[in-house]
């Protein structure tokens, strides 16, 4: 895992190649701090292997919006499934009070 | 082939300044965080300085701080030393090296093959 | 400023035997950042292990790494007659300096 930057910045090189959406675990952003006064930004992949991203580069400002994107549609997904899950139980409710009833 | 070569080395009394270069080849060097790290005669291994791969960060060894300045020109693939008030006590192999690209801190994994440098009066 | 300490100073073996290097460090280190390097004389520092662990590209397999915390150890399982060497352990902690060992000798009996 990263270390707390206390005393430096975390990433001293970034990765030299080419980081697929598909082969991303995890995608954290570090906004810049007293340690370290710069945006830094750390891919976890499928892996486990973690690499540093040049803030920079346009294709990692890319990787990030279609990261972003991913997250938001997941979270909508879960919301979705939230609702869905309380939809059934409202539905079980109102068929077992009218189990209730009939018997 | 990935390849780093030290130049600027030489004799130089105490007191004064000396400016060492570093040229990297075979790789993206813009995407590196590049070490100087020196070896007096007969000893081990100091780390003298590191700069991050945007040049915006730099960090020194106690005994150097203040006297030396580490910097970087990613457009010519090269890396510096800025040595001032040299002292008899920084005669070394002065090395560069390249802090690992692909993971999140590995090591050095390219050495240059050194340059020396001997501050004698 | 975390002191690394490396015993024994000198190792002498014979080829074939295993090698058994130690690393202290005088406060904890994150496994992640400490390496072992081979120098030979007249040439550059290789990096063999990094990550406490892991085996750098092309590093044969006789060579590993271990441990965590203050205390880490680099094994050479069979020495080859190449291995005989000076090898060093180097912390990359989260604050400078990023201090080297004073080395370990493996010497021919």
């Known amino acids: 895992t990263p270390v707390v930057r206390k005393g430096r910045c975390s990433c001293i090189s970034t990765n030299q190649g080419t980081i697929h959406l598909q082969s991303l675990k995890d995608l954290k952003q570090f906004a810049p701090s007293p340690s370290c006064e710069k945006i830094e930004i750390i891919a976890t992949l499928k892996n486990g292997v973690q690499t540093c991203l040049n803030p920079d580069s346009a294709d990692v400002k890319e990787l990030i919006k279609k990261w972003e994107k991913q997250v938001s549609q997941k979270k909508k997904q879960k919301n979705g499934k939230k609702h869905q899950k309380k939809k059934v139980l409202k539905v079980r409710k109102s068929q077992r009070s009218r189990q209730k009833k009939t018997t | 082939q990935v390849q780093l070569v030290e130049s600027g080395g030489g004799v130089v009394q105490p007191g004064r300044s000396l400016r060492l270069s570093c040229a990297a080849s075979g790789f993206t060097f813009s995407n590196c965080g590049m070490h100087w790290v020196r070896q007096a005669p007969g000893k081990g291994l100091e780390w003298v300085a590191l700069i991050g791969f945007d040049g915006i960060n730099e960090y020194y060894a106690d005994s150097v701080k203040g006297r030396f300045t580490i910097s970087r020109d990613n457009s010519k693939n090269t890396l510096y030393l800025q040595m001032n008030s040299l002292r008899a006590e920084d005669t070394a192999v002065y090395y560069c090296?390249?802090?690992?690209?692909?993971?999140?801190?590995?090591?050095?994994?390219?050495w240059g093959q050194g340059t020396t440098v001997t501050v004698s009066s | 400023e975390i002191v690394l300490t490396q015993s024994p100073g000198t190792l002498s073996l014979s080829p074939g035997e295993r090698a058994t290097l130690s690393c202290r460090a005088s406060?904890?280190?994150?496994?992640?950042?400490l390496a072992w390097y081979q120098q030979k004389p007249g040439q550059a520092p290789r990096l063999l292990i990094y990550?406490?662990?892991s085996r750098a590209t092309g590093i044969p397999d006789r060579f590993s790494g271990s441990g965590s915390g203050t205390d880490f150890t680099l094994t050479i399982s069979r020495l080859e007659p190449e291995d005989f060497a000076v090898y060093y352990c180097q912390q990359y902690g989260s604050s400078p300096p990023f201090t080297f060992g004073p080395g370990t000798k493996v010497d021919i009996k």
């Open positions: 990550g406490a662990s």
């Open positions: 090296a390249r802090d690992w690209p692909e993971g999140y801190y590995n090591g050095m994994d390219v």
């Open positions: 406060q904890s280190v994150s496994s992640s950042y």
